[in-house]
């Protein structure tokens, strides 16, 4: 899939995680079909 500028994180959220996509893992591989 393609995203133009991605999903922006909300600075008012309590989480301190970056809103960028995390490192890829094989668990994120798309299902076939």
């Amino acid at each position: 899939s393609e995203t133009t500028t991605g999903t922006s994180s909300n600075s008012s959220q309590s989480t301190s995680n970056s809103g960028l996509a995390p490192n890829p893992t094989n668990a994120t591989t798309k299902a076939a079909g």
Epitope: S1, E2, T3, T5, G6, T7, S8, S9, S11, S16, S18, G19, L20, A21, P22, N23, P24, T25, N26, T28, T29, K30
Partner: antibody, heavy 118, light 107 residues
């Protein structure tokens, strides 16, 4: 050690396309997003987009969305960036860079100079 | 999109000086700011990420601080190899954005 080796310099005519390659070694190619950043002569750094090497999911800078194609070949640990409908202001050094989630753009290729001239 | 404003754009200093470069974000980016050094004809090199964490192999004279919208890069005692252009970059959200750069020149 981590290395990103890019293809050589290109000279293109306006309206043409260019495809730059970036071969990774020294780490698991599928474990990190590959980003593309360009730098026009004497100017700053401009992010173009990134690709997930497993799923091929992509995030783009809106500015390049209609002209850039990012692909990858996991069998040879190589990422590609193709820019179409070239204009003179696309003359720049194009870099690939590995993005680590916590660390950001931690390793960069040596850069590929693309010159667009009639 | 977030905007990053670096100041100053140009900085003249001498070997041994302490220098500070500032990067301001147009909205909060938490701690997610990185700093890069670039020398002419070379690729940028990561110095600091997440505001204050030194990348592996980077000398301890480089120090990053700040969070939210205001960040600083301090070089405690300039060495001859430190004269270069420095860029900040936010890694909090898409699109990834760089500051316009600060060129550090020998006085």
């Amino acid at each position: 050690q981590v290395q990103l080796v890019q293809s050589g310099a290109e000279v293109k005519k306006p309206g043409a396309s260019v495809k730059v390659s970036c071969k990774a070694s020294g780490y698991d190619f599928t474990g990190y997003h590959m980003n593309w950043v360009r730098q026009a002569p004497g100017q700053g750094l401009e992010w173009m987009g990134e690709i997930n090497p497993i799923t091929s999911d992509k995030y783009f800078n809106q500015k390049f969305k209609s002209r850039v194609t990012m692909t990858r070949d996991t069998s040879i640990s190589t990422a590609y960036m193709e820019l179409s409908r070239l204009r003179s202001d696309d003359t720049a050094v194009y870099y690939c860079a590995r993005r680590d989630y916590g660390t950001s753009l931690d390793y960069w290729g040596q850069g590929t100079t693309v010159t667009v001239s009639s | 999109d977030i905007q990053l404003t670096q100041s100053p754009s140009f900085l003249s200093a001498s070997v041994g000086d302490r220098v500070t470069i500032t990067c301001r974000a147009s909205k909060s980016i938490s701690k997610y700011l990185a700093w890069y050094q670039q020398k002419p004809g070379k690729a940028p090199k990561l110095l600091i990420y997440a505001g204050s964490t030194l990348h592996s192999g980077i000398p301890s004279r480089f120090r990053g601080s700040g969070s939210g919208t205001e960040f600083t890069l301090t070089i405690s005692s300039l060495q001859p190899e430190d004269f270069a252009t420095y860029y900040c970059q936010q890694h909090n959200e898409y699109p990834i954005i760089f500051g316009q750069g600060t060129k550090l020149e020998i006085k």
